[in-house]
Amino acid sequence: ESALITQQDLAPQQRAAPQQKRSSPSEGLCPPGHHISEDGRDCISCKYGQDYSTHWNDLLFCLRCTRCDSGEVELSPCTTTRNTVCQCEEGTFREEDSPEMCRKCRTGCPRGMVKVGDCTPWSDIECVHKESGTKHSGEVPAVEETVTSSPGTPASPCSLSG
Protein backbone atom coordinates (compact mmCIF):
# COMPACT_ATOMS: atom_id res chain seq x y z
CA GLU A 1 0.00 0.00 0.00
CA SER A 2 1.48 3.31 -1.01
CA ALA A 3 1.41 6.34 1.24
CA LEU A 4 1.51 8.37 -1.97
CA ILE A 5 4.66 10.38 -1.58
CA THR A 6 5.09 10.79 -5.28
CA GLN A 7 2.73 14.12 -5.82
CA GLN A 8 0.76 15.09 0.25
CA ASP A 9 -2.36 16.85 4.21
CA LEU A 10 -5.26 19.06 4.76
CA ALA A 11 -8.71 20.19 3.69
CA PRO A 12 -9.27 19.78 -0.04
CA GLN A 13 -8.82 23.35 -1.23
CA GLN A 14 -6.44 24.81 -3.79
CA ARG A 15 -4.97 27.64 -1.76
CA ALA A 16 -1.88 28.68 0.09
CA ALA A 17 -2.07 27.66 3.71
CA PRO A 18 -3.17 30.34 6.16
CA GLN A 19 -0.54 31.46 8.64
CA GLN A 20 -2.11 30.25 11.84
CA LYS A 21 -0.34 29.27 15.04
CA ARG A 22 1.13 25.79 14.64
CA SER A 23 3.28 23.59 16.85
CA SER A 24 5.70 23.52 13.95
CA PRO A 25 5.82 25.94 11.01
CA SER A 26 5.09 23.10 8.60
CA GLU A 27 2.50 21.24 10.68
CA GLY A 28 -0.18 19.88 8.38
CA LEU A 29 1.59 21.14 5.28
CA CYS A 30 3.48 19.52 2.44
CA PRO A 31 7.02 20.62 1.63
CA PRO A 32 8.16 22.44 -1.50
CA GLY A 33 8.04 20.09 -4.46
CA HIS A 34 4.88 18.39 -3.16
CA HIS A 35 1.13 18.87 -2.88
CA ILE A 36 -1.46 17.27 -0.63
CA SER A 37 -3.31 14.16 -1.73
CA GLU A 38 -7.04 14.53 -2.35
CA ASP A 39 -7.85 12.38 0.68
CA GLY A 40 -5.62 14.54 2.89
CA ARG A 41 -3.47 11.62 4.00
CA ASP A 42 -0.15 12.25 2.38
CA CYS A 43 2.11 14.52 0.38
CA ILE A 44 2.61 13.72 -3.28
CA SER A 45 5.62 14.79 -5.27
CA CYS A 46 5.20 17.25 -8.13
CA LYS A 47 6.16 15.87 -11.55
CA TYR A 48 9.58 17.04 -12.65
CA GLY A 49 9.37 19.30 -15.70
CA GLN A 50 5.56 19.45 -15.54
CA ASP A 51 4.61 21.16 -12.29
CA TYR A 52 6.10 22.59 -9.11
CA SER A 53 5.48 24.14 -5.69
CA THR A 54 7.85 26.61 -4.08
CA HIS A 55 6.59 26.78 -0.48
CA TRP A 56 5.15 24.63 2.31
CA ASN A 57 1.54 24.25 1.20
CA ASP A 58 -1.78 22.44 1.31
CA LEU A 59 -2.43 22.70 -2.41
CA LEU A 60 -4.42 19.92 -4.05
CA PHE A 61 -2.32 20.36 -7.18
CA CYS A 62 1.17 21.54 -7.93
CA LEU A 63 1.45 24.65 -10.12
CA ARG A 64 1.92 24.15 -13.83
CA CYS A 65 5.38 24.92 -15.18
CA THR A 66 5.71 28.00 -17.38
CA ARG A 67 6.61 27.33 -21.02
CA CYS A 68 8.87 29.95 -22.52
CA ASP A 69 7.25 31.78 -25.44
CA SER A 70 8.83 32.13 -28.84
CA GLY A 71 11.06 35.15 -28.56
CA GLU A 72 12.25 33.94 -25.14
CA VAL A 73 15.12 31.73 -24.10
CA GLU A 74 15.01 29.29 -21.17
CA LEU A 75 17.56 30.28 -18.57
CA SER A 76 16.77 27.41 -16.20
CA PRO A 77 14.31 24.54 -16.49
CA CYS A 78 11.30 23.90 -14.29
CA THR A 79 12.07 21.65 -11.32
CA THR A 80 9.68 20.31 -8.68
CA THR A 81 10.50 23.30 -6.46
CA ARG A 82 11.10 26.12 -8.95
CA ASN A 83 9.31 27.42 -12.02
CA THR A 84 11.00 27.80 -15.39
CA VAL A 85 13.03 30.98 -15.73
CA CYS A 86 12.54 32.60 -19.15
CA GLN A 87 14.34 35.61 -20.56
CA CYS A 88 13.76 37.80 -23.61
CA GLU A 89 16.01 37.01 -26.55
CA GLU A 90 18.91 39.32 -27.36
CA GLY A 91 17.66 42.61 -28.79
CA THR A 92 14.32 42.42 -27.03
CA PHE A 93 13.06 43.33 -23.56
CA ARG A 94 10.07 42.97 -21.29
CA GLU A 95 8.59 46.05 -19.66
CA GLU A 96 6.96 45.99 -16.24
CA ASP A 97 3.75 47.41 -17.67
CA SER A 98 3.56 44.81 -20.46
CA PRO A 99 5.10 41.63 -19.02
CA GLU A 100 3.20 39.35 -21.37
CA MET A 101 5.51 39.86 -24.31
CA CYS A 102 9.06 40.76 -25.31
CA ARG A 103 9.36 43.98 -27.32
CA LYS A 104 12.12 44.93 -29.71
CA CYS A 105 14.70 47.30 -28.32
CA ARG A 106 15.21 50.59 -30.19
CA THR A 107 18.23 50.50 -32.43
CA GLY A 108 19.35 53.99 -31.45
CA CYS A 109 18.53 57.30 -29.82
CA PRO A 110 16.77 60.30 -31.43
CA ARG A 111 18.88 63.23 -32.65
CA GLY A 112 20.22 65.37 -29.89
CA MET A 113 20.28 62.46 -27.47
CA VAL A 114 22.99 60.05 -26.39
CA LYS A 115 22.72 56.43 -25.31
CA VAL A 116 23.57 55.86 -21.64
CA GLY A 117 22.10 52.38 -21.18
CA ASP A 118 22.17 49.27 -23.34
CA CYS A 119 19.31 47.04 -24.37
CA THR A 120 18.86 44.36 -21.69
CA PRO A 121 16.24 41.61 -21.37
CA TRP A 122 14.31 43.85 -18.97
CA SER A 123 14.89 47.34 -20.38
CA ASP A 124 15.11 49.22 -23.65
CA ILE A 125 18.16 51.31 -24.48
CA GLU A 126 18.30 54.44 -22.34
CA CYS A 127 18.69 57.82 -23.98
CA VAL A 128 19.33 61.24 -22.42
CA HIS A 129 19.43 64.74 -23.91
CA LYS A 130 22.98 65.79 -24.66
CA GLU A 131 22.63 69.16 -22.97
CA SER A 132 20.16 68.68 -20.11
CA GLY A 133 20.86 65.01 -19.35
CA THR A 134 17.12 64.36 -18.99
CA LYS A 135 15.80 60.94 -19.98
CA HIS A 136 13.79 60.33 -23.13
CA SER A 137 10.93 57.90 -22.86
CA GLY A 138 9.06 58.55 -26.07
CA GLU A 139 8.12 56.30 -28.96
CA VAL A 140 10.73 54.71 -31.19
CA PRO A 141 11.90 57.57 -33.46
CA ALA A 142 11.86 57.46 -37.23
CA VAL A 143 14.83 55.56 -38.57
CA GLU A 144 16.43 58.62 -40.17
CA GLU A 145 16.39 60.40 -36.82
CA THR A 146 18.30 57.75 -34.92
CA VAL A 147 21.87 57.37 -33.82
CA THR A 148 22.42 53.65 -34.22
CA SER A 149 23.87 51.35 -31.61
CA SER A 150 24.09 47.60 -31.25
CA PRO A 151 21.85 45.85 -28.73
CA GLY A 152 23.35 44.83 -25.39
CA THR A 153 23.87 41.31 -24.16
CA PRO A 154 21.16 39.67 -22.04
CA ALA A 155 22.35 39.21 -18.48
CA SER A 156 19.62 38.05 -16.15
CA PRO A 157 16.02 36.80 -16.08
CA CYS A 158 13.10 39.03 -16.82
CA SER A 159 10.52 36.40 -15.97
CA LEU A 160 11.05 35.57 -12.33
CA SER A 161 10.38 32.10 -11.04
CA GLY A 162 7.20 31.52 -9.05
Epitope: E1, S2, A3, I5, T6, Q8, D9, L10, A11, S23, S24, S26, E27, G28, L29, C30, P31, G33, I36, G40, R41, D42, C43, S45
Partner: antibody, heavy 117, light 107 residues
Framework: QVTLKESGPGILQPSQTLSLTCSFS??????????VSWIRQPSGKGLEWLAH???????RYNPSLKSRLTISKDTSRNQVFLKITSVDTADTATYYC??????????WGQGTLVTVS | DIVMTQSHKFMSTSVGDRVSITCKAS??????VAWYQQKPGQSPKLLIY???TRHTGVPDRFTGSGSGTDFTLTISNVQSEDLADYFC?????????FGGGTKLEIK
Protein backbone atom coordinates in the same frame (compact mmCIF):
# COMPACT_ATOMS: atom_id res chain seq x y z
CA GLN B 1 1.02 21.03 24.19
CA VAL B 2 0.88 17.60 22.52
CA THR B 3 1.27 14.62 24.85
CA LEU B 4 0.72 10.90 24.39
CA LYS B 5 0.80 8.18 27.06
CA GLU B 6 0.69 4.42 26.61
CA SER B 7 -0.72 1.93 29.10
CA GLY B 8 -0.72 -1.86 29.07
CA PRO B 9 -0.74 -4.98 31.22
CA GLY B 10 2.98 -5.05 31.91
CA ILE B 11 3.24 -8.84 31.95
CA LEU B 12 1.20 -11.47 30.17
CA GLN B 13 1.56 -15.11 29.19
CA PRO B 14 2.12 -16.64 25.75
CA SER B 15 -1.04 -17.13 23.63
CA GLN B 16 -2.88 -14.35 25.46
CA THR B 17 -4.17 -11.16 23.81
CA LEU B 18 -2.26 -7.96 24.46
CA SER B 19 -4.41 -4.84 24.85
CA LEU B 20 -2.76 -1.43 24.74
CA THR B 21 -4.22 2.06 25.18
CA CYS B 22 -2.78 5.37 23.99
CA SER B 23 -4.28 8.40 25.73
CA PHE B 24 -3.42 11.74 24.18
CA SER B 25 -4.04 15.45 24.56
CA UNK B 26 -3.20 18.64 22.71
CA UNK B 27 -4.74 17.53 19.42
CA UNK B 28 -7.89 15.97 18.05
CA UNK B 29 -8.10 12.80 16.04
CA UNK B 30 -10.99 14.33 14.14
CA UNK B 31 -8.67 16.84 12.43
CA UNK B 32 -8.10 16.15 8.76
CA UNK B 33 -4.80 14.42 8.07
CA UNK B 34 -4.25 13.42 11.70
CA UNK B 35 -3.25 9.90 12.63
CA VAL B 36 -1.73 7.80 15.39
CA SER B 37 0.60 4.83 15.00
CA TRP B 38 1.82 2.06 17.24
CA ILE B 39 5.55 1.28 17.11
CA ARG B 40 7.49 -1.22 19.22
CA GLN B 41 11.09 -1.70 20.25
CA PRO B 42 12.52 -4.86 21.80
CA SER B 43 15.14 -4.01 24.43
CA GLY B 44 18.42 -2.93 22.82
CA LYS B 45 17.00 -3.35 19.31
CA GLY B 46 15.49 -1.26 16.53
CA LEU B 47 12.03 0.21 15.95
CA GLU B 48 9.20 -1.67 14.23
CA TRP B 49 6.07 0.09 12.96
CA LEU B 50 2.92 -1.91 13.70
CA ALA B 51 -0.25 -0.05 12.72
CA HIS B 52 -1.71 3.38 11.97
CA UNK B 53 -5.20 4.81 12.27
CA UNK B 54 -6.33 7.99 10.51
CA UNK B 55 -8.86 10.61 11.57
CA UNK B 56 -11.46 9.08 9.25
CA UNK B 57 -10.98 5.56 10.72
CA UNK B 58 -8.92 4.33 7.79
CA UNK B 59 -6.37 1.80 9.06
CA ARG B 60 -2.99 0.50 7.95
CA TYR B 61 -1.15 -2.56 9.27
CA ASN B 62 2.32 -4.03 9.00
CA PRO B 63 1.77 -6.99 6.64
CA SER B 64 4.09 -9.23 8.67
CA LEU B 65 1.75 -8.97 11.70
CA LYS B 66 -1.56 -7.98 10.09
CA SER B 67 -3.46 -11.16 11.02
CA ARG B 68 -2.75 -10.55 14.73
CA LEU B 69 -3.30 -6.79 14.93
CA THR B 70 -6.39 -4.64 15.45
CA ILE B 71 -6.16 -0.86 15.81
CA SER B 72 -9.14 1.26 16.84
CA LYS B 73 -9.95 4.64 18.35
CA ASP B 74 -12.33 6.55 20.54
CA THR B 75 -12.17 10.09 19.19
CA SER B 76 -14.32 11.63 21.91
CA ARG B 77 -12.12 10.20 24.68
CA ASN B 78 -8.86 10.96 22.84
CA GLN B 79 -7.73 7.36 22.87
CA VAL B 80 -6.28 4.85 20.41
CA PHE B 81 -6.14 1.13 21.08
CA LEU B 82 -4.10 -1.80 19.81
CA LYS B 83 -4.83 -5.49 20.26
CA ILE B 84 -2.28 -8.21 19.48
CA THR B 85 -3.56 -11.76 19.60
CA SER B 86 -1.62 -14.95 20.38
CA VAL B 87 1.39 -13.22 21.89
CA ASP B 88 4.75 -14.89 22.09
CA THR B 89 8.03 -14.07 23.87
CA ALA B 90 9.10 -12.33 20.63
CA ASP B 91 6.42 -9.72 21.37
CA THR B 92 8.29 -8.59 24.48
CA ALA B 93 9.12 -4.94 23.82
CA THR B 94 8.47 -1.34 24.73
CA TYR B 95 5.36 -0.20 22.87
CA TYR B 96 5.05 3.42 21.77
CA CYS B 97 2.21 5.39 20.27
CA UNK B 98 3.15 8.34 18.08
CA UNK B 99 1.28 11.05 16.23
CA UNK B 100 1.74 11.57 12.53
CA UNK B 101 0.30 14.23 10.26
CA UNK B 102 1.55 14.39 6.68
CA UNK B 103 5.00 13.11 7.31
CA UNK B 104 7.03 11.85 10.24
CA UNK B 105 6.21 10.87 13.82
CA UNK B 106 6.57 14.30 15.40
CA UNK B 107 5.32 13.34 18.87
CA TRP B 108 5.87 10.11 20.81
CA GLY B 109 4.61 8.73 24.08
CA GLN B 110 7.00 7.63 26.83
CA GLY B 111 6.39 3.96 26.01
CA THR B 112 5.05 1.03 28.00
CA LEU B 113 7.07 -2.12 28.61
CA VAL B 114 5.30 -5.37 27.84
CA THR B 115 6.85 -8.67 28.89
CA VAL B 116 5.56 -11.99 27.59
CA SER B 117 6.69 -14.69 29.99
CA ASP C 1 8.85 -3.48 2.01
CA ILE C 2 11.42 -0.70 1.77
CA VAL C 3 14.55 -1.63 3.69
CA MET C 4 16.42 1.22 5.40
CA THR C 5 20.05 0.34 6.01
CA GLN C 6 22.28 2.14 8.47
CA SER C 7 25.65 0.60 7.71
CA HIS C 8 27.35 1.71 10.93
CA LYS C 9 25.91 0.23 14.11
CA PHE C 10 28.39 2.24 16.18
CA MET C 11 30.23 5.48 15.57
CA SER C 12 32.79 7.02 17.87
CA THR C 13 33.50 10.74 17.95
CA SER C 14 34.90 13.45 20.20
CA VAL C 15 33.28 16.59 21.60
CA GLY C 16 33.60 19.37 19.03
CA ASP C 17 33.99 16.98 16.10
CA ARG C 18 31.72 16.58 13.09
CA VAL C 19 30.10 13.21 12.39
CA SER C 20 27.95 11.94 9.52
CA ILE C 21 25.49 9.07 9.94
CA THR C 22 24.28 7.50 6.71
CA CYS C 23 21.11 5.67 5.73
CA LYS C 24 20.34 3.90 2.46
CA ALA C 25 16.85 3.04 1.20
CA SER C 26 16.31 -0.09 -0.91
CA UNK C 27 14.23 1.96 -3.36
CA UNK C 28 13.54 5.59 -4.17
CA UNK C 29 11.71 7.32 -1.31
CA UNK C 30 12.07 10.87 -2.60
CA UNK C 31 12.63 13.06 0.44
CA UNK C 32 10.16 11.21 2.71
CA VAL C 33 12.77 10.44 5.35
CA ALA C 34 12.97 11.38 9.02
CA TRP C 35 15.77 11.11 11.57
CA TYR C 36 15.14 10.40 15.27
CA GLN C 37 17.38 10.63 18.32
CA GLN C 38 16.85 8.21 21.19
CA LYS C 39 18.74 8.75 24.41
CA PRO C 40 19.10 5.88 26.90
CA GLY C 41 15.80 5.17 28.67
CA GLN C 42 13.86 7.70 26.59
CA SER C 43 11.46 7.57 23.66
CA PRO C 44 12.65 8.63 20.19
CA LYS C 45 12.57 12.33 19.38
CA LEU C 46 12.15 13.76 15.90
CA LEU C 47 15.21 15.67 14.68
CA ILE C 48 14.83 15.99 10.90
CA TYR C 49 11.95 15.35 8.49
CA UNK C 50 11.48 15.61 4.74
CA UNK C 51 15.18 14.68 4.61
CA UNK C 52 16.45 18.15 5.52
CA THR C 53 13.90 20.10 7.59
CA ARG C 54 14.88 20.58 11.22
CA HIS C 55 12.09 19.96 13.73
CA THR C 56 11.10 22.74 16.13
CA GLY C 57 13.67 23.26 18.89
CA VAL C 58 16.36 21.07 17.33
CA PRO C 59 19.80 22.73 17.49
CA ASP C 60 21.19 23.86 14.14
CA ARG C 61 24.24 21.63 14.52
CA PHE C 62 21.94 18.82 13.30
CA THR C 63 21.62 18.81 9.51
CA GLY C 64 19.91 16.36 7.18
CA SER C 65 20.56 15.87 3.50
CA GLY C 66 19.88 13.51 0.62
CA SER C 67 17.08 12.34 -1.64
CA GLY C 68 16.13 9.20 -3.52
CA THR C 69 18.00 6.41 -1.78
CA ASP C 70 20.92 8.01 0.08
CA PHE C 71 20.49 10.11 3.21
CA THR C 72 22.84 11.64 5.76
CA LEU C 73 22.44 13.09 9.23
CA THR C 74 25.38 15.34 10.07
CA ILE C 75 26.11 16.54 13.59
CA SER C 76 28.66 19.34 13.64
CA ASN C 77 30.34 20.45 16.87
CA VAL C 78 29.28 17.27 18.67
CA GLN C 79 28.27 17.77 22.31
CA SER C 80 28.35 15.21 25.13
CA GLU C 81 24.53 15.29 25.26
CA ASP C 82 24.43 13.96 21.67
CA LEU C 83 25.35 10.50 22.98
CA ALA C 84 22.34 8.53 21.73
CA ASP C 85 20.99 6.11 19.14
CA TYR C 86 20.00 7.66 15.80
CA PHE C 87 17.38 6.08 13.55
CA CYS C 88 16.30 6.94 10.02
CA UNK C 89 12.76 6.20 8.86
CA UNK C 90 10.95 6.29 5.53
CA UNK C 91 7.32 7.35 5.25
CA UNK C 92 7.14 7.13 1.48
CA UNK C 93 5.01 3.99 1.56
CA UNK C 94 3.49 1.47 3.93
CA UNK C 95 4.72 -0.35 5.87
CA UNK C 96 6.77 2.48 7.36
CA UNK C 97 10.25 1.19 8.08
CA PHE C 98 13.18 2.25 10.25
CA GLY C 99 16.88 1.79 9.92
CA GLY C 100 18.59 -0.48 12.44
CA GLY C 101 20.06 2.49 14.27
CA THR C 102 23.51 3.98 14.81
CA LYS C 103 24.83 4.36 18.35
CA LEU C 104 26.93 7.49 18.72
CA GLU C 105 29.64 7.12 21.33
CA ILE C 106 31.63 10.02 22.71
CA LYS C 107 35.34 9.37 23.23
Amino acid sequence: QVTLKESGPGILQPSQTLSLTCSFSGFSLSTSGMGVSWIRQPSGKGLEWLAHIYWDDDKRYNPSLKSRLTISKDTSRNQVFLKITSVDTADTATYYCARRRLGPFAYWGQGTLVTVS
Amino acid sequence: DIVMTQSHKFMSTSVGDRVSITCKASQDVGTAVAWYQQKPGQSPKLLIYWASTRHTGVPDRFTGSGSGTDFTLTISNVQSEDLADYFCQQYSSYPYTFGGGTKLEIK
